[in-house]
């Protein structure tokens, strides 16, 4: 059974990842440029069901593509490199979802555009954090 | 383990119908987009068509658009191909294959279709 | 429709040696929508490398994948005997989803 000490360490990690994922979202919607409409003919793949933390291996998944728009970008809105801002993510996406879980994902029929995947990863968090406090 | 079988290929004559399956296991298959792809003899891979995991939505090469259609039955774990208006340049080993996001991840080991007179 | 045009046809090595295949398409492709197969004769393809540098699951790590744009590369580093085959590169970037017509990697 989780302790409240791990379950406290998870609210932290998902607040993290919450907020970094904002801070991506906030630095597209900033972002005055034609390049935007070039980010936004990417396709994102979406979880069919995203509720649990193992459900995080499809956003794991995506984290490749995430890297090559925001490299589009060039963007002064994010503090970091897209490299360094997916690396931290990864880094939590893994220690959230488990390394050792063998969970093949399952996506949605429909692709979406980067700020529809956002939104809905963003939406997970919040929705998984307030089942923890 | 994901499985993927492929049948129903044979000798046809120009002109007929046949009709391939692929019987899956192993994964949830009403979560993934299928596809077949097809390998004429000694030759390279050529996509053929798809189909999203619901079944709702369907894509195909020109090059057999209104001749083939594919289907699947996800209470079976079926995808099939309906082929009609068979022609020769349609000879060729018919692989199925699970759809992974942008890649193809697993396949099938292959039905060999002849058309021929 | 995006061509896959991959080079060279054939590549005649010995095992141990490093094999450095080609694959060059028609218009920008993005590189997570790059893929690599592997196919021995008789066989159906296998998966090695997809998002142009991943390895899949399995995969030896000789076996590696770089490049973007229009300009990508498999990259064996050291042969070994049950490599000998034929390698496709995959787009799935535009529609339809295209093949390169591969590259044989033969013994020499």
């Known amino acids: 059974a989780p302790t409240s000490s791990s379950t406290k360490k998870t609210q932290l990690q998902l607040e993290h990842l919450l907020l970094d994922l904002q801070m991506i979202l906030n630095g597209i919607n900033n972002y005055k440029n034609p390049k935007l409409t070039r980010m936004l003919t990417f396709k994102f793949y979406m979880p069919k069901k995203a509720t649990e933390l193992k459900h995080l291996q499809c956003l794991e998944e995506e984290l490749k593509p995430l890297e090559e728009v925001l490299n589009l970008a060039q963007s002064k809105n994010f503090h970091l490199r897209p490299r360094d801002l997916i690396s931290n993510i990864n880094v939590i996406v893994l220690e959230l979802k488990g390394s050792e879980t063998t969970f093949m994902c399952e996506y949605a029929d429909e692709t979406a555009t980067i700020v529809e995947f956002l939104n809905r990863w963003i939406t997970f968090c919040q929705s998984i954090i307030s089942t923890l406090t | 383990e994901v499985q993927l079988l492929e049948s129903g290929g044979g000798l046809v004559q120009p002109g007929g119908s046949l009709r391939l399956s692929c019987a899956a296991s192993?994964?949830?298959?009403?979560?993934?987009?299928m596809s077949w792809v097809r390998q004429a003899p000694g030759k390279g891979l050529e996509w053929v068509s798809a189909i999203s995991g619901s079944g709702g939505s369907t894509y195909y090469a020109d090059s057999v658009k209104g001749r083939f259609t594919i289907s699947r039955d996800n209470s079976k774990n079926t995808l099939y191909l309906q082929m009609n208006s068979l022609r020769a340049e349609d000879t060729a080993v018919y692989y199925c294959?699970?759809?992974?996001?942008?890649?193809?991840?697993?396949w099938g080991q292959g039905t060999l279709v002849t058309v021929s007179s | 429709e995006i061509v896959l045009t991959q080079s060279p046809g054939t590549l005649s090595l010995s095992p141990g040696e490093r094999a450095t295949l080609s694959c060059r398409a028609s218009q920008s492709v993005s590189s997570s929508y790059l893929a690599w197969y592997q196919q021995k004769p008789g066989q159906a393809p296998r998966l090695l490398i997809y998002g142009a540098s991943s390895r899949a699951t399995g995969i030896p790590d000789r076996f590696s994948g770089s490049g973007s744009g229009t300009d990508f590369t498999l990259t064996i580093s050291r042969l070994e005997p049950e490599d000998f085959a034929v390698y496709y590169c995959?787009?799935?970037?535009?529609?339809?989803?295209?093949f390169g017509q591969g590259t044989k990697v033969e013994i020499k």
């Open positions: 192993g994964f949830t298959f009403s979560s993934y987009a």
């Open positions: 294959a699970k759809r992974h996001a942008r890649y193809f991840d697993y």
């Open positions: 995959q787009q799935t970037w535009g529609s339809p989803p295209t």
